[in-house]
């Protein structure tokens, strides 16, 4: 049976998996795959390590910890609803049927929408593609995405709107900048 982990759309998902190397540097191959662990190997491999290195990975999938110390937890960057499903972490211990298998069920929830102050709501309604957030976890940062295609008059109006608004303070406090 699989164990459930949760993340929100746009966040990074963390799927923990560990093993204890028999001795320092005595690593065993590990694979991560989308779908439940089959009898052998991993199906739909997204990341693989061998006795020395991470030798295969796909974009958005990476190991956050030090796999040389047995931390083979998977991070999936900027998840979407399509990332939902079961993932297999397989520790490929030498010998017949010695592998350790972990089936982890990732449940992706829609991003929480928090009510904003009136001024900010007016602003984001006028420029809906401007304000976005990226990142997850302790190092979460807030950034501004690309400005929509607007003319100089609109930018000037926008600057005036921002000057003494609460949003301007929020943006300054968060270290975000307008690009």
């Amino acid at each position: 049976s699989e164990v459930e982990y949760r993340a929100e759309v746009g966040q990074n998902a963390y799927l923990p998996c560990f093993y204890t190397p028999a001795a320092p540097g005595n690593l065993v191959p590990v694979c991560w795959g989308k779908g439940a662990c089959p009898v052998f190997e991993c199906g739909n491999v997204v990341l693989r390590t061998d006795e020395r290195d991470v030798n295969y990975w796909t974009s958005r999938y990476w190991l956050n910890g030090d796999f040389r110390k047995g931390d083979v937890s998977l991070t999936i960057e900027n998840v979407t609803l399509a990332d939902s499903g079961i993932y297999c972490c397989r520790i490929q211990i030498p010998g017949i049927m010695n592998d350790e298998k972990f089936n982890l069920k990732l449940v992706i929830k829609p991003a929480k929408v928090t009510p904003a102050p009136t001024r900010q709501r007016d602003f984001t309604a006028a420029f809906p593609r401007m304000l976005t957030t990226r990142g997850h976890g302790p190092a979460e940062t807030q950034t501004l995405g690309s400005l929509p295609d607007i003319n100089l008059t609109q930018i000037s109006t926008l600057a005036n709107e921002l000057r003494d608004s609460r949003l301007a303070n929020d943006l300054r406090d968060s270290g975000a900048t307008i690009r």
């Epitope: 164990v3 923990p16 560990f18 320092p24 540097g25 030090d66 110390k69 931390d71 982890l104």
Partner: antibody
Amino acid sequence: EVQLQQSGAELVKPGASVKLSCTASGFNIKDYYMHWVKQRTDHGLEWIGRIDPDNGETKYAPKFQGKATITADTSSNTAYLQLGSLTSEDTAVYYCARSSPYYFDYWGQGTTLTVSS
Amino acid sequence: DIQMNQSPSSLSASLGDTITITCHASQNINVWLSWYQQKPGNIPKLLIYKASNLHTGVPSRFSGSGSVTGFTLTISSLQPEDIATYYCQQGQNFPYTFGGGTKLEIK
């Protein structure tokens, strides 16, 4: 034989800082995560943080962020815990431990820190 | 943070008894749970890792079970040397957290 030898007891004044050491023998600290754990009298165990001596990367419990700094010197096979702005709440036994990778398989003998004027 | 709620906080049992200590995690930690024994005036010692794996040199009367959020440490045929405080610890998420401890006494 794996051993973690910690520095001796410390008596320090409030407001001061202190640096505790943990010297490993029987293994190379670069191959493990090194942790520090706090235990006050009649209290449980509290995880302070850890370091990956291989690259210096650290993780701290939020409670100890700004209070504790963990470092490591791989040439002397030693991990350090520095505690700043000391108060009576910091009076405790501090243990170093290594992890493999998520559990603590070997512990130091502990260093007693007393903060008193 | 993941809270680890351990019960009971203290326990009195007779030699030869079988006792059970439970640990409940506030969220899923799969099997990434360890148990430690700390005898009076001594350092903590690892008993069990990955919820049920016995650490080298630990007597077989100690056993662990459970997964996800519920875990138990069982000591069968209690011995005088088992007088100690026992702690659970989760190692899945930072910050790592310990249970409050269970102090075991002999009747």
